[in-house]
Amino acid sequence: DAHKSEVAHRFKDLGEENFKALVLIAFAQYLQQCPFEDHVKLVNEVTEFAKTCVADESAENCDKSLHTLFGDKLCTVATLRETYGEMADCCAKQEPERNECFLQHKDDNPNLPRLVRPEVDVMCTAFHDNEETFLKKYLYEIARRHPYFYAPELLFFAKRYKAAFTECCQAADKAACLLPKLDELRDEGKASSAKQRLKCASLQKFGERAFKAWAVARLSQRFPKAEFAEVSKLVTDLTKVHTECCHGDLLECADDRADLAKYICENQDSISSKLKECCEKPLLEKSHCIAEVENDEMPADLPSLAADFVESKDVCKNYAEAKDVFLGMFLYEYARRHPDYSVVLLLRLAKTYETTLEKCCAAADPHECYAKVFDEFKPLVEEPQNLIKQNCELFEQLGEYKFQNALLVRYTKKVPQVSTPTLVEVSRNLGKVGSKCCKHPEAKRMPCAEDYLSVVLNQLCVLHEKTPVSDRVTKCCTESLVNRRPCFSALEVDETYVPKEFNAETFTFHADICTLSEKERQIKKQTALVELVKHKPKATKEQLKAVMDDFAAFVEKCCKADDKETCFAEEGKKLVAASQAALGL
């Protein structure tokens, strides 16, 4: 499938609009600090060049790889060293090292201002004045803040973003129409970014085998009627797509994702009965729909797993002949029977099975040795079941905000060295598992909860990797991808932690808190809670709750006062003194 000109090939496959959008995303994900106008200029130059190659594939430089072309273009940025420091050294390297260098400098937490949403009328005017620039700006702002965002999916978000403005800017009540849609896109976008970040971390930190194992388990749950060979083909193709996107090869990734969607829809009879509606949609919607499609029904009367994987005399022979294929079949068979298990649990079971076979197939009596292997699965299954049941009961008792606070205290005591903003962000997201998953029946709770927790804990891992401060976090993040959640669950209070010095400024609040949204106010209070725990890690939850209740009352009182600022100053001092006394600070 060799083409004289790769850039011409992708331009023709994707079309000009998608080509330009994907190049913009790629550049914004690499050079996260560059101004919008600079990126647009670079994209236009690349697009013009691509058109010359479409016209004549033998034209000068058209035979160069996309990495070479894009890298050369990025390296023309004049302010590279001033803006990015050592990233400029990447430009002295040759491909493929140069691209690897750019990838290593992607920043999961770039120092960029928070995106502030303008007034609806201002947005609608900007949309009408220059729709193309408005939508490009959206792609740019999301891509630079989320350098691993799944690019073809970002095109789908942009399409929905455009549709929201097209509809709502004509509505009688523009704000009532638009704001809920933008909120939904924002929340879905954050979730999509975090899910993709885990896929990239899986590939980059644990390798292709780890990602493929995850994909076998997930696709087998989703398509339990598909044959193993079919699932294997889908896994291979899906791995290629995500490897490309995570590697910055966004044009290839989008092209291959479209091909995969096409293949799935052409072969839906042998894949899943749930794909019909998805396959009637246009490309971007189709791909999104397939990625989110519900699990198909399990085939009737599937035989017991024990026959092939425990009772058979040929277990060790089959394993020795093709280890990964045999383990893949085990994972496929187990996963298609267990849509009620999380993917990470299925992977733990497969790992246990693999470890047992490695040990037993070298033993004097292999069958005797592995005969009870399925008994070893019981505690592995019960552990997340118990944890989820316990968490859901607590969520039911406390509600989301107080449940988040319970997790904030728990995680701050486990890893107090982690920065307060990271602890707040991660614990708030961990706490959302309650409203997201606890409403589900038992059979759907574990895949919802534990796989969501894997995504959130990966956020902690990638943020911590940027500035490592805790050996315990590093250990849980790097030892085993599938055991990250059990590793964090098992962490005890860090007894080596030296409490933070008390700083009254940390607990000084002003009248501006009164104008904040409920969410922002919660974050302020939760930030204070984390700081309290860092000052007094031995404080009981009841002591902390009492202080937090006093704090909430103080904010409510001062926000109702005529002279808010004076109230915050005077009552704030009293609150700090009372809290110090209550906690023995």
Epitope: L394, Q397, A406, R410, E492, T540, K541
Partner: nanobody, 122 residues
Framework: QVQLVESGGGLVQAGGSLRLSCAAS????????MGWFRQAPGKERVFVAT???????YYADSVKGRFTISRDHAKNTVYLQMNNLKPEDTAVYYC????????????????WGQGTQVTVSS
């Protein structure tokens, strides 16, 4: 202040039974998770069983099927019925309580009793 007082420990033959009680005072415990940990000589404290505010029960694998945890909300008391005791159950048993009772680690529980000795002879 909060107090947890255990009782019911003692010396018992292997295969025998004991019933531990834990009376909680100092506040209302009806919304707390309550439970039991144990510590054998020279070992760490380990989880035995816990019961939630909704009376859902959780057990360590080593005691499942032999021990039963229950509570009386009105009396602020939690019980541990221990049957078919084994020598390896010998330990000091601690009653625990926590308003959030999330997890199975010792540090997940803020309130601890003084402990009651259980010795199982073979």
């Amino acid at each position: 202040q909060v107090q947890l007082v255990e009782s019911g420990g003692g010396l018992v033959q292997a295969g025998g039974s004991l019933r531990l009680s834990c009376a909680a005072s100092g506040r209302t415990f009806s919304n707390d998770a309550m439970g039991w940990f144990r510590q054998a000589p020279g070992k760490e404290r380990v989880f035995v069983a816990t019961i939630s505010w909704k009376s859902s029960t959780y057990y360590a694998d080593s005691v499942k099927g032999r021990f039963t945890i229950s509570r009386d909300h009105a009396k602020n008391t939690v019980y541990l019925q221990m049957n078919n005791l084994k020598p390896e159950d010998t330990a000091v048993y601690y009653c625990v309580a926590d308003p959030y009772g999330l997890g199975f680690n010792p540090s997940d529980y803020d309130y601890w009793g003084q402990g009651t000795q259980v010795t199982v002879s073979s």
